[in-house]
């Protein structure tokens, strides 16, 4: 029976700069029941605080709700593991909410085959930003990426869409059924998960781009 091993805070993520969650990996348990606590202070403060919510983010997590989340402030946090034989502390982690944003996937992806009379046909897609993100405040610039592939293909074809929420693709294989997905990323931060796949059947008479 030993003191617990050193825990590690391995990830902090925010969906929208308004709340965030951090997760830690326990070290070895030393063969005894181990209690974990996360303490933090904001840089420039002297008072330490303890995690306000160990529940929302699941096991081994700390969730910071709106009233505990400050942009432009660096959080300094560590996890303490304690059992009957002693304690161990994680390394301090410095967290700036601005740089840990991982949005939810974009919403309402719609895909259509457009066949204008006077121009080549194309695949047109549009989507909406995730609901948790308020783009009107100017705090966010969201960038988008699209990927698509024929249903039975192994490889995805990826296109960067920049800040626009619609996109055209000209080069497609006639008669194929395609899967299309979109994801987004703030200017500083992490890519979201891909949106659920939307399927589109390309007509057999679709004319490939020269």
């Amino acid at each position: 029976q030993l003191p617990p091993g050193k825990p590690e805070i391995f990830k902090c993520r925010s969906p929208n700069k308004e709340t965030f969650t951090c997760w830690w990996r326990p070290g070895t348990d030393g063969g005894l029941p181990t209690n974990y606590s996360l303490t933090y202070h904001r840089e420039g403060e002297t008072l330490m605080h303890e995690c306000p919510d160990y529940i929302t983010g699941g096991p081994n997590s700390c969730h910071f709700g709106k009233q505990y989340t400050s942009m432009w402030r660096t959080y300094v946090m560590m996890v303490n593991a304690t059992n009957q034989m002693g304690s161990s502390f994680s390394d301090e982690l410095y967290v700036d909410v601005t740089y840990i944003v991982q949005p939810d996937p974009p919403l309402e992806l719609t895909v259509e085959v457009k066949q204008p009379e006077d121009r080549k046909p194309y695949l047109w897609m549009k989507w909406s930003p995730p609901t948790l993100i308020d783009l009107k405040t100017g705090w966010f610039t969201l960038l988008y990426e699209i990927r698509l592939k024929p249903e039975k293909a192994a490889e995805w074809e990826t296109h960067f869409a920049g800040q626009q929420t619609e996109f055209k693709i000209l080069s497609l294989h006639p008669g194929q059924k395609y899967l299309v997905q979109v994801r987004c990323k703030p200017d500083h931060g992490y890519w979201s998960a891909w949106s659920p796949a939307t399927f589109i059947q390309i007509p057999s008479d679709f004319i490939m781009n020269d």
Partner: antibody, heavy 118, light 107 residues
């Protein structure tokens, strides 16, 4: 509606002990640091002790250090103050208060009176 | 320990008056200061936190300002229900401390 209700106050002789309780309702008790604050008759407010969400951070005023012990039971939504070696100067109304770490002591109980007298 | 000095200790004023209470900290506390109102036989009530943020449900005639070592609580137009004792509190470092209080009485 947030409610904090203190109990356990009363008359005790110098050197005696009391245990105060604070029952919380209408809040996610486990998400907040909690505090005891006291007010001697006709005097100002004095912070006594604070305890963090999972009890990993505990602090006391110098005037009670070594004599008072703060604790909490999140499963019972309850805060406690064990007071030993009581002195005349501990006579006061004792309030429990929720500490919103983003703000201040935003909810207070109605208080319980502790009288230390021979 | 950080000492908080409130001025004045007593203040006589009339309904409609503009009232200012000052709280000085013995060392810098950034903006970690709160103001409370207490009426006889009642628990304190939070008015202002982080020096200038109005607590939800508190009338807008109350305002706070300052940072570092000097802070003020202002009541722009005193109402009958505002006659009470006001306390400042620092939340910058332990031990958390309160000012001595300012009693606002009817002139």
């Amino acid at each position: 509606e947030v409610q904090l209700v203190e109990s356990g106050g009363g008359l005790v002789k110098p050197g005696g002990s009391l245990r105060l309780s604070c029952a919380a309702s209408g809040i996610t008790f486990s998400s907040y640091s909690m505090n005891w604050v006291r007010q001697a008759p006709g005097k100002g407010l004095e912070w006594v002790s604070s305890i963090s969400t999972r009890s990993s951070l505990i602090h006391y005023a110098d005037s009670v250090k070594g004599r008072f012990t703060i604790s909490r039971d999140n499963a019972k939504n309850s805060l406690y103050l064990q007071m030993n070696s009581l002195r005349d100067e501990d006579t006061a109304v004792y309030y429990c208060a929720r500490w919103d770490a983003a703000a201040a002591f935003d909810y207070w109980g109605q208080g319980t009176l502790v009288i230390v007298s021979s | 320990d950080i000492q908080l000095t409130q001025s004045p200790s007593f203040l006589s004023a009339s309904v409609g008056d503009r009232v200012t209470i000052t709280c000085w900290a013995s060392q810098g506390i950034s903006s970690y200061l709160a103001w409370y109102q207490q009426k006889p036989g009642k628990a304190p009530k939070l008015l202002i936190y982080v020096a200038s943020t109005l607590q939800s449900g508190v009338p807008s005639r109350f305002s706070g300002s300052g940072s570092g070592t000097e802070f003020t609580l202002t009541i722009s137009s005193l109402q009958p229900e505002d006659f009470a004792t006001y306390f400042c509190q620092q939340l910058n470092s332990y031990p958390l401390t309160f000012g001595g209080g300012t009693k606002v009485e009817i002139k």
